[in-house]
């Protein structure tokens, strides 16, 4: 297992599969997307990333989904952070939450290979998909709930789809939403979000 020394006092050492889903729409400017990436990397610095502890995936979504890091990628935490920092700014007209939740359900969590770990999708959303794309939204959220995947929506800015955020929250008590007025609030909320995710994950059982 490839490990590196902790970079911060708070360091989440739990059994967790965490997926970062980044809104690639033009509702975020290129500069705002830079702040979003910095937030993801800052969060990753506070996780004990390894195949044994916290596994991470990073996906940018627009009308489709682009995975930059997969849960099973065996790389040093610093290398994974470097890859996350290089996520491309798509600036597309549409970012489909339905499509990315479908991708999370059928691609990322198609097989549950770590039943002992918590599964969380951190949905960073700043836009609203067209109604025609959201027909199966609830179905995908329910599918994720069946697979015990907690969905944590982080609404960013005035165009985040509050209706979808509320629908996600209704599906499970753990699906706590964070609604921010802009990317400038991400840094302020970071520690609270990391703590919340970490508290949802089990500690490793003591060695027998």
């Amino acid at each position: 297992d490839i490990s590196e020394p902790p970079l911060h006092d708070f360091y989440c050492s739990r059994l967790l599969d965490l997926v970062f889903l980044l809104d690639g729409s033009s509702r975020l400017s290129e500069a705002e997307f830079e702040v979003l990436k910095a937030f993801v990397v800052d969060m990753m610095e506070r996780l004990r990333i390894s195949q044994k502890w916290v596994r991470v995936a990073v996906v940018e979504y627009h009308d489709g989904s682009h995975a930059y890091i997969g849960l099973k990628d065996r790389k040093r935490p610093s290398e994974l952070r470097r890859i996350a920092s290089q996520v491309k700014y798509a600036g597309s007209q549409v970012a489909s939450t339905s499509e990315v939740l479908k991708y999370t359900l059928f691609q990322i969590f198609s097989k549950i290979d770590r039943p002992e770990a918590s599964r969380i999708a951190l949905l960073l959303m700043a836009s609203q998909e067209p109604q025609r794309m959201s027909r199966n939204f609830v179905r995908y959220v329910q599918g994720l709930k069946k697979k015990k995947v907690i969905v944590i929506p982080v609404g960013i800015g005035p165009h985040a789809n509050l209706k979808q955020i509320r629908l996600i929250e209704k599906q499970a008590p753990e699906n706590k939403a964070f609604v921010l007025s802009s990317v400038d609030e991400l840094e302020q909320q970071r520690d609270e979000i990391v703590s919340y995710l970490c508290d949802l994950a089990p500690e490793a059982p003591p060695p027998t």
């Epitope: 400017s29 290129e30 500069a31 705002e32 830079e34 702040v35 990436k37 910095a38 990397v41 470097r82 920092s85 290089q86 996520v87 491309k88 700014y89 600036g91």
Partner: nanobody, 126 residues
Framework: EVQLVESGGRLVKAGASLRLSCAAS????????MAWFRQAPGKEREFVAF???????LYTSSVRGRFTISRDNGKNTVYLQMMNLKPEDTAVYYC????????????????????WGQGTQVTVSS
């Protein structure tokens, strides 16, 4: 290859304004995110401001509201308008460019920028 040349730095009094320019040559300028960094004597180089290919901007907290980064794609130039200058703004100011809009990194880290100018000295006296 991108070449960057800064200009506009000089000695000014506290409270004055100054505009730095960074002229770029060598490739498609309009698609490149750019930034200004600065290095004060005896200190490490630090991030000042960022401008995306869409002209969206970011600033370090100490200059927000006083400095403005802008770009003129027709002239292949990025500017840093500095107002209400303070003695603590004294530094060599460097212009930096990404290698492309799509190979990036964290905006406030030096390693995210492939191309650098030689720097221009700004001195603010009290």
């Amino acid at each position: 290859e991108v070449q960057l040349v800064e200009s506009g730095g000089r000695l000014v009094k506290a409270g004055a304004s100054l505009r730095l320019s960074c002229a770029a040559s060598g490739r498609t300028f309009s698609s490149l995110p750019m930034a200004w960094f600065r290095q004060a004597p005896g200190k490490e180089r630090e991030f000042v401001a960022f401008i995306g290919s869409d002209s969206s901007t970011l600033y370090t907290s100490s200059v927000r509201g006083r400095f403005t980064i802008s770009r003129d794609n027709g002239k292949n130039t990025v500017y840093l308008q500095m107002m209400n200058l303070k003695p603590e703004d004294t530094a060599v100011y460097y212009c930096a460019a990404r290698s492309s809009a799509f190979s990036s990194g964290i905006y406030y880290r030096e390693g995210s920028y492939a191309y650098w100018g030689q720097g221009t000295q700004v001195t603010v006296s009290s």
